[in-house]
């Protein structure tokens, strides 16, 4: 059985979430990967995705989200810059592998963003910045519209910390390709 695990990140507005998703298998290196938010009772929403095929060390930017796939390490690096309180929520990485369902990567990320910029960021000390310079060679990738006969039967489990997610949508600029994909356990 799949064991859903979460990593909690507590950051201030203006800081950067900088995390990695481990995709384990070399066969997934070139697969398209996506960063999703999970809201209780809803299907995950894709906020950004890599190109197809996914290129090595090639930044893809969608609004304030930057994805970089490092094939040599089997890791997808995800950055969300200039965080806002409304970004709080549960996130996950998935690998698109049509016609099969997306392959979910652990751990899920429980992000808690609080008001007030602090010079002592704690858990994200290397990634604190109000102004973020976007790499010059970023690309915007179109995320595939993925459909499946399976439907959501239950909400994803809540964190033990039980952090509430704001009802408002995430305010990410230039996100034109938000899609829905099914939850699977």
């Amino acid at each position: 059985a799949t064991k859903l695990t979460e990593e909690k990140y507590e950051l201030k507005e203006g800081q950067t979430l900088d995390v990695k998703c481990d995709y384990t298998l070399e066969k997934f290196a070139s697969s398209q990967k996506a960063w999703q938010i999970i809201r209780d009772g809803e299907m995950p929403k894709t906020l950004a995705c890599t190109e197809r095929p996914s290129k090595n060390s090639h930044p893809v930017q969608v609004g304030r989200i930057i994805l970089e796939d490092y094939h040599d390490h089997g890791l997808l690096r995800v950055r969300m810059v200039n965080l806002q309180v409304e970004d709080s929520g549960l996130y996950q990485c998935v690998i698109y592998q049509p016609p099969k369902e997306p392959h979910m990567l652990f751990d899920r990320i429980r992000l808690v963003v609080t008001k007030g910029f602090s010079g002592t960021p704690g858990s994200n000390e290397n990634s604190t910045q109000n102004v973020y310079k976007i790499p010059p060679t970023t690309t915007k990738a179109l995320c595939p519209l993925y459909t499946s006969p399976r439907t959501v039967t239950q909400a994803p489990p809540k964190s033990t910390a039980d952090v509430s997610t704001p009802d408002s949508e995430i305010n990410l600029t230039n996100v034109t390709d938000i899609i829905r994909v099914p939850v699977f356990n």
Epitope: K3, H73, G74, S123, N124
Partner: antibody
């Protein structure tokens, strides 16, 4: 070529601390995890913990909580392992390793730490 | 933590024959349809080398005579045909959950 270069052997007194270094070449440590592994003479391998250099987050084996502190300096692509309150049980070779496929690859050559009065 | 028990502790195999090393986990190391079991080889005076990751995937530059299998709690490393160069210690390691843990090791020698 991808490489991890570790600091030279250390001879330290009981009760003292030691800080080992591991410098990456051929890749940026921000883009991976760095792990540390202990191997006592003629014995097996023990995972100490790992760091995500991009955000400073660390994970440790319970046995090494309070004993080991893992840090990283991304400007020099160097990870560090500090060991405190050293005893003879800490005499070992300490390896840093890069990360691949949910495990460890790109091993450093190891640093021998000898605790002796 | 997940405890890994390797067997046998030592093994002698004739050149050209098959060597099989087993590793049993105290609980399943499967998650998301993947077995998080890895195998390392360590020769005397050398650093460990990744042979197999995720139960059955060969590490970079690893000869085809090394193969891994298993799922859940029971895994094995097979070496066939055995060569002189394969004399070493072999360790299994799980990366399903922290703390990552290693088996006690198996010493493989030529008979």
């Amino acid at each position: 070529a991808v490489q991890l270069q570790q600091s030279v052997a250390a001879l330290v007194r009981p009760g003292a601390s030691v800080k080992l270094s591991c410098t990456a070449s051929g890749f940026n440590i921000k883009n991976t995890y760095i792990h540390w592994v202990k191997q006592r003479p003629e014995q097996g391998l023990e995972w100490i913990g790992r760091i995500d250099p991009a955000n400073g987050n660390t994970k440790y084996a319970p046995k090494f909580q309070g004993k080991a502190t893992i840090t990283a300096d991304t400007s020099s692509d160097t990870a560090y392992l500090q060991l405190s309150s050293l005893t003879s049980d800490d005499t070992a070779i300490y390896y840093c390793t890069g990360h691949y496929g949910s495990t460890m690859d790109y091993w450093g050559q190891g640093t021998s730490v000898t605790v002796s009065s | 933590e997940i405890v890994l028990t390797q067997s046998p502790a030592s093994l002698a195999v004739s050149l050209g024959q098959r060597a099989t090393i087993s590793c049993r986990a105290s609980e399943s190391v499967d998650n998301y349809g993947i077995s998080f079991m890895n195998w390392f080889q360590q020769k005397p005076g050398q650093t460990p080398k990744l042979l197999i990751y995720a139960a059955s995937n060969q590490g970079s530059g690893v000869p085809a005579r090394f193969s891994g299998s298993g799922s859940g709690t029971d895994f094995s490393l097979n070496i066939h045909p055995m060569e002189d160069d394969d004399t070493a210690m072999y360790f299994c390691q799980q990366s399903k959950e922290v703390p990552w843990t290693f088996g006690g090791g198996t010493k493989l020698e030529i008979k």
